[in-house]
């Protein structure tokens, strides 16, 4: 089915979502003051091999458990990221972004990353994939 | 029952190398990270570094850096902290401590009972 | 790297005695309305214990006679009726900053 302008403002929408989610995150815990960021930085992240359709959300997917467990560690009295309802949220709109009609399997680079460098490469994803809708 | 078991007492020469172990047990060992911390006869206590057992990602003080080495087995509970040509100013008190982050704290809950290392000619 | 300064270096108390130790950071130790302060005892030849974190909080299992206190740079570890068990050496922790740094211990020994 070819894809409308409603169904793309819809896929725009989910993905500035996510995009804002991620950003809140990274936000979050990429300040140099953050007591945890050292320790946070010792995780590890599967990245995609390649990352330039929806489908390819499916390597997100897979590492949302080890980005809540490092979120985890996150939390203060002023910043309340509530990871489970977090990572959750992203869930949701990580499955209506990529379907579930194929199955795809994530391929992934050699290199492991930390939590900053998997963020901002999801990031990445999510603005050029935006980029390409408007 | 959570802790952590240390191996035993080492006597070494100088320019020696050595390893010592810190066993974890009662808990998912992969959960938590694995802190190393110093105590010179004596003297209070010194931070060294810590490991992800999970990931194997350090971070060490800069104090520390390329003077010892931590790595762990996961696949057998254990940190290690290694030596790669002693010095006498290496003899002391080595302890691994547990590492809790969660919500708002940064403690070491649980502590091994400590390695002593003697480096003497 | 922060240095803790903890006072006095060591003192002789009784059984009973009403013991405060304090800890003064080179620079606060806050961090979004969170103090990363902790405090632990060490008894001669034993690994350190947990007593407090987070400034306040009580390590389960450790007496209530402990209670701590303080934010930004000034601590307080207060034992209020000292036992004979608590004869130790105590320090504070700050672990808001890398390295996590140690104060240089409080001995508290039987007048």
């Known amino acids: 089915m070819a894809p409308t302008s409603s169904s793309t403002k819809k896929t725009q929408l989910q993905l500035e979502h996510l995009l804002l989610d991620l950003q809140m995150i990274l936000n979050g815990i990429n300040n140099y003051k953050n007591p945890k960021l050292t320790r946070m930085l010792t995780f590890k992240f599967y990245m995609p091999k390649k990352a330039t359709e929806l489908k390819h959300l499916q390597c997100l997917e897979e590492e949302l458990k080890p980005l809540e467990e490092v979120l985890n560690l996150a939390q203060s009295k002023n910043f309340h990221l509530r990871p489970r309802d977090l990572i959750s949220n992203i869930n949701v709109i990580v499955l209506e972004l990529k379907g579930s009609e194929t199955t795809f399997m994530c391929e992934y680079a050699d290199e492991t990353a930390t939590i900053v460098e998997f963020l901002n490469r999801w990031i990445t994803f999510s603005q050029s994939i935006i980029s390409t809708l408007t | 029952e959570v802790q952590l078991v240390q191996s035993g007492a080492e006597v070494k020469k100088p320019g020696e190398s050595l390893k010592i172990s810190c066993k974890g047990s009662?808990?998912?060992?992969?959960?938590?990270?694995i802190e190393w911390v110093r105590q010179m006869p004596g003297k209070g206590l010194e931070w060294m570094g810590v490991i992800n057992p999970g990931s194997g990602g350090t971070y060490y003080n800069e104090k520390f850096k390329g003077q010892v080495t931590i790595s762990a087995d996961k696949s057998i509970s254990t940190a290690y902290l290694q030596w790669s040509s002693l010095k006498a100013s290496d003899t002391a008190m080595y302890y691994c401590?547990?590492?809790?982050?969660?919500?708002?704290?940064?403690?070491?809950?649980?502590w091994g009972q400590g390695t002593t290392v003697t480096v003497s000619s | 790297a922060i240095r803790l300064t903890q006072s006095p270096s060591s003192f002789s108390a009784s059984t009973g005695d009403r013991v405060t130790i304090t800890c003064k950071a080179s620079q606060s130790v806050d961090y979004q309305g969170d103090s990363y302060m902790n405090w632990y005892q060490q008894k001669p030849g034993k690994a350190p214990k947990l007593l407090i974190y987070?400034?306040?909080n009580l390590e389960s299992g450790v007496p209530s006679r402990f209670s701590g206190s303080g934010s930004g740079t000034d601590f307080t570890l207060t034992i209020s009726s000292l036992q004979s068990e608590d004869f130790a050496t105590y320090y504070c922790?700050?672990?808001?900053?890398?390295?996590?740094?140690f104060g240089g211990g409080t001995k508290v020994e039987i007048k």
């Open positions: 401590a547990r590492w809790r982050g969660e919500g708002y704290y940064a403690y070491f809950d649980v």
């Open positions: 987070s400034a306040s």
């Open positions: 922790q700050q672990s808001n900053e890398d390295p996590y740094t």
């Open positions: 009662g808990y998912a060992f992969t959960n938590y990270l």
